[in-house]
């Protein structure tokens, strides 16, 4: 058999079989590369629902290769069929020649018919494939259209955004100009503020020198006052002696013993100077008053003469007290106590005092903070604390917030926090918001003293969550 293509029917293939004087020509369909096998959900045709179109790389070429492979299979099968027919025909033709020539035509027609039927079936199948390929091609065209629509949309959005960016850039440059103008204004204002500050500094330094002069005068007056008190005491003694003498001469039977005026002490420094040099509880008198208060005097530490204004040591006294209690004092001077804000305020406004805060932790360590100038404002100013000149081992930064704050209690909220520090952290203290210290917090025993926000705190020595074992606050005149 031979195969050939006719130029006018390039899409067809002719299979010609020559058998003796008879020639049989079979017209077979040829694969023309435009078919595609049916696919099920190979990709989503609704491409507009995607952010970017789904593209299978070299999709159609892959499918064409597949179809070529299918066609090759068909061709091989047809060739096998052809060979089979040829072989069969050889033996059949021999028989026909033997049997009868007239039967030959009938048999050949039957074989040809079978062959044509099979070929027609194959043609129908290939026609189906062609239809499917057309279907898929149409679908691809639709997708491409959808993709181009999507691309157009994106291009439009980009254009819109570009114009928006341009608008924002315009706005930005306008705002930049404004900011620059404001900066110029700000610089001018700063210069004027600096000038005012310099003027104020001059004023402050003038006032400081005046204050120093006044302090000197006060000290002199205090000394004079002491001298006068001594003179008064001596005079009283002389008068008493004279009275005694007079009463003795007038009536030996009824002698009158004059009651000696007891010397009053303003602080423990005066007690120390009067010769009492042992630790203990002493009665002190409010400045310019006869009102008395009991205080513990430390006559040994650092030269003695210290008035103890606060002590914590064992948790035996509740320090969550009212404003009035902190004003007048509470507790036991031999143990845990608060001397009283009113007395301390009056005392520290009479002359210059130093404040020493002595601290103990649970590991046996001790530390102190010493402020070279300390005083409390009056009750009208909420006993605000004033401190200057920190030295000592309990931290280089003051754990009492600077500048000083007003005193706060559970019933007198004067802190700088929207919360109520005294209620939250417990105890009366010079709370900031709420600040790095509180020596009047809850007393926690050993093993319970860590991770406690409301304990006895001195931040710049032991940190925020550490509650101390013992604290003592003591004051003494700066010139002691």
């Amino acid at each position: 058999s031979n195969q050939r293509r006719s130029p006018e029917n390039s899409g067809r293939r002719y299979n010609r079989i020559q058998h003796g004087q008879c020639a049989y020509t079979f017209i077979l369909p040829e694969h023309d590369g435009n078919c595609r096998e049916s696919t099920t959900d190979q990709y989503n045709t609704n491409a507009l629902q995607r952010d970017a179109p789904h593209v299978e790389p070299d999709f159609s070429s892959q499918k064409l290769q597949h179809l070529e492979h299918v066609m090759e299979n068909y061709t091989q099968w047809l060739q096998k069929l052809e060979n089979y027919i040829v072989e069969n025909m050889k033996s059949e033709m021999a028989q026909i020649q033997q049997n009868a020539v007239q039967n030959q035509t009938a048999v050949m027609i039957e074989i040809g018919t079978n062959l044509l039927n099979q070929t027609a079936e194959q043609t129908r199948k290939l026609t189906d494939v062609e239809a499917q390929v057309l279907n898929q091609t149409t679908r691809l065209e639709l997708q491409l259209l959808e993709h181009s629509l999507s691309t157009n949309k994106l291009e439009k959005q980009i254009l819109d955004q570009t114009s928006e960016i341009n608008k924002l850039q315009d706005k930005n440059s306008f705002l930049e100009k404004k900011v620059l103008a404001m900066e110029d204004k700000h610089i001018i204002q700063l210069q004027s503020i600096k000038e005012e500050k310099d003027q104020l500094q001059v004023l402050v330094s003038k006032q400081n020198s005046i204050i120093e002069e006044l302090e000197k005068k006060i000290v002199t007056a205090t000394v004079n006052n002491s001298v006068l008190q001594k003179q008064q005491h001596d005079l009283m003694e002389t008068v008493n002696n004279l009275l005694t003498m007079m009463s003795t001469s007038n009536s030996a039977k009824d002698p009158t013993v004059a009651k000696e005026e007891q010397i009053s002490f303003r602080d423990c420094a005066e007690v120390f100077k009067s010769g009492h040099t042992t630790n203990g509880i002493y009665t002190l008198t409010f400045p310019n008053s006869t009102e008395e208060i009991k205080a513990y005097c430390d006559m040994e530490a650092g030269g003695g003469g210290w008035t103890i204004i606060q002590r914590r040591e064992d948790g035996s006294v509740d320090f969550q007290r009212t404003w009035k209690e902190y004003k007048v004092g509470f507790g036991n001077p031999s143990g845990e106590y608060w001397l009283g804000n009113e007395f301390v305020s009056q005392l520290t406004n009479q002359q210059r005092y130093v404040l020493k805060i002595h601290l103990k932790d649970w590991e046996g360590n001790e530390a102190y903070s010493l402020y070279e100038h300390f005083y409390l404002s009056s009750e009208e100013l909420n006993y605000r604390i004033h401190l200057k000149g920190l030295t000592g081992t309990a931290g280089k930064i003051s754990s009492i917030s600077q500048p000083g704050n007003d005193f706060s209690t559970k019933d007198g909220d004067n802190d700088k926090c929207i919360c109520k520090c005294s209620q939250m952290l417990t105890g009366g203290w010079w709370f900031d918001a709420c600040g790095p210290s509180n020596l009047n917090g809850m007393y926690y025993p050993q093993r319970q003293n860590t991770n406690k926000f409301n304990g006895i705190k001195w931040y710049y020595w032991k940190g925020s969550g550490y509650s101390l074992k013992a604290t003592t606050m003591m004051i003494r005149p700066a010139d002691f």
């Epitope: 948790g315 809850m442 926690y444 025993p445 050993q446 093993r447 319970q448």
Partner: antibody, heavy 120, light 106 residues
């Protein structure tokens, strides 16, 4: 086995004194904080006092401060509670309790208790 | 002083049933809470500490929960040996006990 046995309880007149002892065994006493907890008849539990491993720290409940003193003898594996100026309200079963290691007042082992009766 | 309040005072439960005991602190004690069991004539026994951690040898039917001021002890299925008095104790600020809850057979 961890064991604690209290002794020294009994009948005492108001104002009188008693010394309670607790003999510990099955563990090293010097490694633990120790406590006394009491229970009045038909009532709840009340912590009374505790003492650090080496005896350097002692705490007492306010109601017994100045009257009761906790102490220990690690060499003898013993804990003590010296009670003076006794009052009727001190009548209770007194338990010796071991503080759970590294805790701050968790009592993981208890003695069977000794009864103190203050009455005239 | 931190006051511990237990409720109810007495709880009547049938064996096999669940029992829920409550304990409230007068101020926040974080998770520093323990539960003890005491049977008549015996010393207390530690059940739970840290509000929810079972002590050594305590059965899984005992569980604790809560933090701050509200705490709960749950016994999932009461056994005959669980009928006793239960105490809560805080160890956040000094040491105080609740007045106790008696769990009795219904």
């Amino acid at each position: 086995e961890v064991q604690m046995v209290e002794s020294g309880g009994g009948l005492v007149q108001p104002g009188g004194s008693l010394r309670l002892s607790c003999a510990a065994s099955g563990f090293t006493l010097r490694s633990y904080w120790m406590s006394w907890v009491r229970q009045a008849p038909g009532k709840g539990l009340e912590w009374v006092a505790n003492i650090k491993e080496d005896g350097s720290e002692k705490y007492h409940v306010d109601s017994v401060k100045g009257r009761f003193t906790i102490s220990r003898d690690n060499a003898e594996n013993s804990l003590f509670l010296q009670m003076s100026s006794l009052r009727a309200e001190d009548t209770a079963v007194y338990y010796c309790a071991r503080d759970m290691e590294a805790s701050a007042g968790l009592f993981d082992y208890w003695g069977q208790g000794t009864l103190v009766t203050v009455s005239s | 002083e931190i006051v511990m309040t237990q409720s109810p005072a007495t709880l009547s439960v049938s064996p096999g049933e669940r029992a829920i005991l409550s304990c409230r602190a007068s101020q926040s004690i974080s998770s520093n809470l323990a539960w003890y069991q005491q049977k008549p004539g015996q010393a207390p026994r530690l059940l739970i500490y840290g509000a929810s951690t079972r002590a050594t040898g305590i059965p899984a039917r005992f569980s604790g929960s809560g933090s701050g001021t509200e705490f709960t002890l749950t016994i999932s299925s009461l056994q005959s040996e669980d009928f006793a008095v239960y105490y809560c104790q805080q160890y956040n600020y000094w040491w105080t006990f609740g007045q106790g809850t008696k769990v009795e057979i219904k």
